[in-house]
């Protein structure tokens, strides 16, 4: 039975609705009666939407789809999906089923335009022709990445100290955050253009800078230069200082935290008063020492997406900022040790060795050692998945051939923490089950 | 209207230099890049560099870079190029272009009619 | 670099066919520009920031993009169209063109 269905993808944009197309040829006095039909996700082959004893048997699939049950008997078996997300991307495969049987996969390109870009300067005053200022690009929303690229004035390419970063939100749309360093000239226009290569849409966006003398005696803001570490649920403190001169008050203060990267507002304090948290209620100054300049930031609660950079702004008449480095971190648990086979082993045998260790933050190193602390590196594969929280779950996979008797280790380090948590297991010569019975 | 006058044809020897000019004229000169580009007799096109003639400065293709200089003189509203050391290699038609547009696309709008460079003993 | 591969090289077709050339890019490119060369003659700019006609190109010139590959179409030939067709980037240094398309009316 031939099935057809394009050759091309779908493209669907998130939120809309979209048609798999998919078709038979039915054979005269053919009815609904000896069909089935099966639409199924092609990797895993979970069940989406089926047809079957002369009956829809409805959508296994989020109550997202439906047939098109008056085209059937012409042999269009074709799905609609409604409300497309991100995670519908990937292939569906028709399966029909008459007398005989025929199948065919059809893909489903996902995609969303990305916003207009925003364009930010750091610093944004007191610009002057040889200050080095970072502009950032910000565009949102957007699937799948972007492209991005940036130019001058004059549509020359600017490459070199462009850093793009690009996150997905919890329903798989991008944020593209895109840096430049550039040293001003006498004055200058930079432009960023995303790019949605699916869609082949471009969002634009240019700033001008016309740099100029500044005045003088901006204020001396006061970061640590090194980053605070924090554990996560922990709080941290996010220490700014600036130096109050005589007779300052706190009506004559602005003080702002945000995010250095995308400028979303953290926590503010302006015309006398403490306007609050903008950032999850998560953070707190310390109102009783702010008088003596210390305009520090708690972070309460510290969660993996804090981590980051975060901008201390401080005006008074004049103005000053600096920017602190939060390095979120969360230690690895004692790794669990698994063989396999774990049954009747004996010299020569090859065994796979897991070392898993889990919910830790940033991601680990794992370094696997013999009994004679001789460096295990050939055969190891380590993967590290990250779960809603962020946090890492870490396995190390080592196939070995046994010897007459040996101990293997496995070591999973925090870089940040430096902290070390290991596990071994010690295979003997002799055949053996693992775990050892009682 | 927008044109850009390139200077006559050169015949050289192998080992000496020359140098072209490519005159503006019907815009505002310092406004936009000028560029020049290489190409050999049935052969395709070869981008040599280009000058900001408001700011000079200059970038080139690495291929081209220890042989060429590009300058520009405002004053007359006039690009010009020099090739140092000459081989057969450089015996080819040389345009120079105005790259045109307006944020973010730009492209080649006004070319010159060429300038010949023929090398020869 | 951008290599811009241009095929096919030599492209020979009658008046009134439709006719496709392609340019395709090493990696992703800002927008595509397109000129038009006739013996003895300079460049003209013949397509601009990937689909737009330059000042006098007539509407049966039209691009489509799919990846990193370009494909210039020219839906009814014309004498008039027989020249040399590159393409040309600049998303990053050097600007580079594409080695050409020839397209002979037979």
């Known amino acids: 039975l031939e099935v057809q269905v394009p050759e091309d993808p779908v493209v669907a944009l998130v939120g809309t609705d979209a048609t798999l197309c998919c078709s038979f040829s039915p054979e005269p006095g053919f009815s609904l009666a000896q069909l089935n039909l099966i639409w199924q996700l092609t990797d895993t082959k979970q069940l989406v939407h089926s047809f079957a004893e002369g009956q829809d048997q409805g959508s296994a699939y989020a109550n997202r789809t439906a047939l098109f049950p008056d085209l059937l008997a012409q042999g269009n078996a074709s799905l609609r999906l409604q409300r497309v997300r991100v995670a519908d991307e990937g292939s569906f495969t028709c399966f029909v089923s008459i007398r005989d049987f025929g199948s065919a996969a059809v893909s489903l390109q996902v995609a969303a335009p990305y916003s207009k870009p925003s364009m930010t300067l750091e610093p944004n005053k007191d610009l002057r022709p040889g200050d080095t200022v970072t502009i950032t690009c910000s565009s949102y929303q957007g699937y799948p990445e972007a492209e991005v690229f940036w130019q001058d004035g004059q549509g020359v390419p600017l490459t070199g100290n462009v850093t793009t970063s690009q996150m997905a939100n919890e329903q798989g749309l991008f944020d593209v955050h895109s840096i430049l360093r550039v040293v001003l000239g006498a004055n200058g226009t930079y432009s960023c253009l995303v790019r949605n290569p699916v869609l082949q849409q471009d969002a634009h966006s240019s700033v001008t800078i016309t740099p100029q003398r500044s005045p003088t005696g901006a204020v001396e803001v006061q970061v640590p230069e090194d980053p605070v570490v924090a554990l996560v649920g922990t709080d941290a403190t996010l220490r700014c200082s600036f130096s109050p001169e005589p007779g300052f008050s706190l009506a004559q203060l602005n003080l702002i935290w945000q995010l250095t990267d995308t400028k979303q507002l953290v926590h503010s304090f302006t015309e006398g008063r403490d306007q609050g948290s903008a950032y999850a209620n998560r953070t707190a100054l310390f109102p009783d020492l702010l008088a003596q300049g210390n305009a520090s930031l708690r972070l309460q609660r510290v969660r993996v997406a804090d981590e980051g950079s975060f901008t201390c702004f401080v005006s008074i008449r004049d103005f000053g900022s600096a920017a602190v480095s939060l390095q979120v971190a969360a230690p690895y648990s004692k790794p669990s040790m698994t063989l396999e086979p774990n049954k009747d082993l004996r010299p020569g045998d090859t065994v796979t060795i897991t070392c898993s260790s889990y919910r830790g933050y940033p991601e680990a190193e794992v370094f696997w050692q013999d009994g004679q602390g001789v460096p295990l590196t050939g055969n190891v594969t380590t993967s590290q998945m990250a779960n809603e929280q962020g946090l890492f779950d870490v396995h190390s996979v080592l196939r070995v051939v046994l010897g007459a008797n040996g101990t293997y280790s496995c070591l999973v380090r925090n870089p940040v923490l430096q902290q070390d948590a290991h596990g071994s297991v010690t295979i003997t010569g002799q055949p053996m089950t693992f775990p050892p019975e009682a | 209207q927008v044109q850009l006058q390139q200077s006559a044809a050169e015949l050289a020897r192998p080992g000496a230099s020359v140098k072209m000019s490519c005159k503006a004229s019907?815009?505002?000169?310092?406004?936009?890049?000028i560029h020049w580009v290489k190409q050999r007799p049935g052969q395709g096109l070869e981008w040599i560099g280009y000058?900001?003639?408001?700011?000079?400065?200059?970038d080139y293709n690495q291929k081209f870079k220890d042989e060429t200089t590009l300058t520009a003189d405002r004053s007359s509203s006039t690009a010009y190029m020099q090739l140092i050391s000459l081989t057969s290699e450089d015996s080819a038609v040389y345009y120079c272009?105005?790259?045109?547009?307006?944020?973010?696309?730009?492209?080649?709008?006004?070319w010159g009619a060429g300038t010949t460079v023929t090398v020869s003993s | 670099q951008i290599v811009l591969t241009q095929s096919p090289a030599i492209l020979s077709a009658s008046p009134g066919e439709k006719v496709t050339m392609t340019c395709r890019a090493s990696?992703?490119?800002?927008?595509m520009n397109w000129y038009q060369q006739k013996p003895g003659s300079s460049p003209k700019p013949w397509i601009y920031?990937?689909?737009n006609l330059a000042s006098g190109v007539p509407a049966r010139f039209s691009v489509s993009v799919s990846g990193t590959s370009h494909s210039l179409t020219i839906s009814r030939v014309e004498a008039e169209d027989a020249a040399t067709y590159y393409c040309q980037q600049w998303s990053s240094n050097p600007l580079t063109f594409g080695a050409g398309t020839k397209l002979e009316l037979k």
């Open positions: 272009a105005r790259y045109s547009g307006s944020t973010p696309y730009w492209y080649f709008d006004v």
């Open positions: 990696s992703s490119v800002s927008y």
């Open positions: 019907g815009y505002s000169f310092t406004s936009y890049t």
């Open positions: 000058i900001n003639p408001n700011s000079r400065n200059t």
């Open positions: 920031a990937t689909s």
